[in-house]
């Protein structure tokens, strides 16, 4: 149930390998910075995606069934107390906005999480259960394919995924309040 997921995310992550990141060939990563969007809108070039009409129950189900497990696997070998949660969200569309931004927008020290399994599943669940979201991803996907990546592990990516876990937990909690 929900409590099991919450407890699994509170306890110390089991031992294992750290997360990986894909960085540009010049090793500098990307200069794009992560910004907060409290409106529930995601900037995609000139297009803003509004998460208001998503099927939140279906997204919750996908998260609890599979995405949460991949996030925890990524964090294996670290303690949940290793990182402080600095990113928050106030409602379901805002939580999805922050989750989308943190998962797919490159940051200086964690260039891309987009190839990770949890990210691929996040993209799939948003594409499936958020009307019109897939259309906004067509050009973004084509642009991403043109960038050659190589894997590097960074502590900053672990911190970013820790923030993602917190955002997803917040998303579930805001969903519970509504029911």
């Amino acid at each position: 149930g929900l409590n099991d997921i919450f407890e699994a995310q509170k306890i110390e992550w089991h031992e294992g390998g750290g997360g990986s990141d894909y960085k540009d060939d010049d090793d500098k990563g990307s200069s794009h910075h992560h910004h907060h969007h409290s409106s529930g809108l995601v900037p995609r070039g000139s297009h803003m995606y509004d998460f208001t009409n998503c099927d939140f129950q279906k997204i919750e189900a996908d998260y609890l069934r599979t995405i949460s497990k991949d996030l925890i696997t990524y964090m294996s070998g670290t303690k949940s107390t290793d990182f402080n949660n600095t990113v928050s969200c106030s409602n379901r569309p805002h939580c999805l906005t922050e989750i989308q931004s943190l998962t797919f927008n490159p940051t200086p020290r964690c260039a891309s999480l987009a190839k990770e399994m949890f990210a691929r599943k996040t993209k799939a669940t948003l594409a499936l259960w958020c009307p019109g979201y897939s259309e906004t991803q067509i050009n973004a996907t084509q642009a991403m394919k043109k960038r050659r990546k190589r894997k590097v592990t960074t502590n900053k990516c672990l911190e970013q995924v820790s923030q993602l876990l917190g955002l997803w937990r917040r998303f579930i909690r805001t969903l519970l309040k509504k029911q």
């Epitope: 189900a61 996908d62 599979t66 993209k123 594409a127 009307p131 991803q137 067509i138």
Partner: antibody, heavy 120, light 107 residues
Framework: QVQLVQSGPEVKKPGSSVKVSCKAS????????MHWVRQRPGQDLEWMGT????????DYNQNFKGRATITADKSTSTAYMELSSLRSEDTAVYYC?????????????WGQGTLVTVSS | EIVLTQSPGTLSLSPGERATLSCRAS??????VHWYQQKPGEAPRLLIY???QSISGIPDRFSGSGSGTDFTLTISRLESEDFAVYYC?????????FGRGTKVEIK
């Protein structure tokens, strides 16, 4: 190359069930959802539902909810569509079609179709 | 459920002519419309996706346009192999739906 090969034609009695298979090859099975679409004789295309292997989840057209079950065996890259409580109106060609769930997002490859005839 | 209305039901044209097929959605669906061609006894074949995106291997005489609720598939110069039924489909939200089709027949 991408191929979706469906099982052969079926003749069924009213009230019985049919299970149609769709064997995928030439691509990574979990990168795509498998949709099922039917076409009754001389009629339009009707979306029945989908199974998303990446997320282990499915979604159905309400018109078929309770009667249609869509599953997949990831180890053999095969999707299945089972339709129960068959009636004569279910006589149709049933198609499987793949759709990317992390890219493309469109039904870009289709099976050859499976004719299911429901007759007493 | 989003309803897609295609018009005309049948289009009678000669080879070399221009074909304009319409698809209207019952609500705003941005550009989440795809076009398929179907010939008798065959599975549908994808022609255009997300209103105007072209598919490799599809002749460039096929083009799509539109957004919101009104969409158009244009065949600039009809070839003999283009006489078939054309369907629009929306993937904006579940349940996915198809239009009733436009039959392009030889005049």
């Amino acid at each position: 190359q991408v191929q979706l090969v469906q099982s052969g034609p079926e003749v069924k009695k009213p009230g019985s069930s049919v299970k149609v298979s769709c064997k995928a090859s030439g691509y990574i099975f979990t990168d795509y959802a498998m949709h099922w679409v039917r076409q009754r004789p001389g009629q339009d295309l009707e979306w029945m539902g989908t199974f998303i292997p990446l997320l282990d989840t499915s979604d159905y057209n309400q018109n078929f909810k309770g009667r249609a079950t869509i599953t997949a065996d990831k180890s053999t890259s095969t999707a299945y569509m089972e339709l129960s409580s068959l009636r004569s109106e279910d006589t149709a060609v049933y198609y499987c079609a793949r759709m990317g769930v992390t890219h493309s997002y469109v039904m870009d490859a289709w099976g050859q179709g499976t004719l299911v005839t429901v007759s007493s | 459920e989003i309803v897609l209305t295609q018009s005309p039901g049948t289009l009678s044209l000669s080879p070399g002519e221009r074909a304009t097929l319409s698809c209207r959605a019952s609500q705003h669906i941005s550009r989440s419309v795809h076009w398929y061609q179907q010939k008798p006894g065959e599975a549908p074949r994808l022609l255009i996706y997300f209103a105007s995106q072209s598919i490799s291997g599809i002749p460039d005489r096929f083009s799509g346009s539109g957004s919101g609720t009104d969409f158009t598939l244009t065949i600039s110069r009809l070839e003999s192999e283009d006489f078939a039924v054309y369907y629009c489909q929306q993937s904006y939200s579940f349940p996915y739906t198809f239009g009733r089709g436009t039959k392009v027949e030889i005049k």
